[in-house]
Interface confidence: low
């Protein structure tokens, strides 16, 4: 389980055309459910139940986004429509170039994602928890345009990170 280095860039613009960018860094883990690859794309927040919808006409995004899914406590969803791995697959099928799971409230998901799979996804499936997950969700919940870069090694040059 290798470390995934995640850089998130938040882009804010004003009506006057000015803009400011904020960058923050966090770390997660590449799970065995996916590939240990670098990936990059605009963040799309997905509700776990939103991935249950099997209608291919709905919720399709252009290829290349990074799906962020905050998993809920297992008690809140005792009979999930899909396993965590199934949700990752569904996101990739819909065009995600990577999936990041916040497993803070469902640590059991880590084992599910790391169970040996005969057919792992060809895109990275990363999980975050604790302070890193809080950082990520704080950004995602701002509902502003944000972009994630996932790398399997630290950035070649140190990036200035700013907590959101």
């Amino acid at each position: 389980k290798e470390t995934a280095f995640v850089e998130v860039v938040l882009f804010e613009s004003s009506p006057s055309g000015d803009y400011t960018t904020y960058t923050t860094g966090l770390t997660g883990r590449f799970s065995r459910a996916g590939a240990t690859l670098s990936a990059e794309g605009e963040i799309v927040q997905m509700h776990p139940l939103g991935l249950c919808n099997n209608n291919d006409e709905e919720d399709l995004y252009e290829y290349g986004w990074v799906g962020v899914v905050k998993l809920e406590q297992p008690e809140l969803d005792p009979k999930p429509c899909l396993t965590v791995l199934g949700k990752a697959k569904r996101a990739v099928q819909r065009g995600a170039t990577a999936v990041i799971f916040d497993v803070s409230e469902n640590p059991e998901a880590i084992d599910q994602l790391n169970q040996g799979s005969e057919d792992p996804l060809k895109r990275p499936v990363v999980y975050v928890k604790g302070a890193d997950a809080i950082k990520l969700m704080n950004i995602v919940n701002k509902q502003k345009v944000a972009r994630a870069r996932i790398q399997h090694r630290p950035p070649r040059q140190p990036t200035e990170y700013f907590d959101m």
């Epitope: 055309g17 000015d18 990936a39 990059e40 200035e160």
Partner: antibody, heavy 121, light 108 residues
């Protein structure tokens, strides 16, 4: 009107130094990530480097071809971007453009008119 | 770093559709931007983030990007569109901005 105006170009001998300036107006310069891009005569565009804004810690990054020789700096109080070029080589001969970088620091939406730097003995 | 390859030249008749390609390894995983440069002038951004058009750019300019190829399409090409066109991306693996070699569009 959003505008960038470069100055400081000219003729310099190999091994010499030159400092280019880029005066910005019409937008909040201190928020912007700024870049230098060059174009050798009759050739294509080549990214030189950029500087982040204050929020980004004024971090700079450079193309491999100029790293260690060129330095980008900025003076937000003067709305001015600089490019200090040392140990110049004949292959550095080009029109140098300053540009504002947006959309996750990838695309350049505002360009200056460029200033010609000629490195020749 | 990723390398972007463009055809050196493309010719088109007025009113026809011009397509300029830009190829690179897994380019569809990156955002691609396109610039128009006329002789003696600075480049102008005509398409950003694969297919977005900045304000002031005519609707006849459009872009797409998938697989290993990004394409700039100019429908109903006009004489004033004759220029050099450059694709560009941000190589986030190496923190560098990369330009293609440029394509000279000739309107016959």
């Amino acid at each position: 009107e959003v505008q960038l105006v470069e100055s400081g170009g000219g003729l310099v001998k190999p091994g010499g130094s030159l400092r280019l300036s880029c005066a910005a107006s019409g937008f909040t310069f201190s928020n912007a990530w700024m870049s230098w891009v060059r174009q050798a005569p009759g050739k294509g565009l080549e990214w030189v480097g950029f500087t982040k804004n204050e929020v980004g810690g004024y971090t700079t990054e450079y193309a491999a071809s100029v790293k260690g020789r060129f330095t980008i700096s900025r003076d937000d109080s003067k709305n001015t971007l600089y490019l200090q070029m040392n140990s110049l080589k004949t292959e550095d001969t080009a029109v140098y453009y300053c540009a504002r970088a947006i959309y996750y620091l990838e695309a350049f939406d505002v360009w200056g008119q460029g200033t010609l730097v000629t490195v020749s003995s | 770093d990723i390398e972007l390859t463009q055809p050196p030249s493309v010719s088109v008749s007025p009113g026809q559709t011009a397509s300029i390609t830009c190829s690179g390894d897994s380019l569809g995983s990156y955002y691609v931007h396109w610039y128009q440069q006329k002789p003696g002038q600075a480049p102008v951004l005509v398409i950003y983030r694969n297919k977005q058009r900045p304000s002031g750019i005519p609707e006849r300019f459009s872009g797409s990007n998938s697989g290993n190829t990004a394409t700039l399409t100019i429908s109903g090409t006009q004489a004033e569109d004759e220029a050099d066109y450059y694709c560009q991306t941000y190589d986030w693996m190496y923190s560098s901005r990369v330009f293609g070699g440029g394509t000279k569009l000739t309107v016959l």
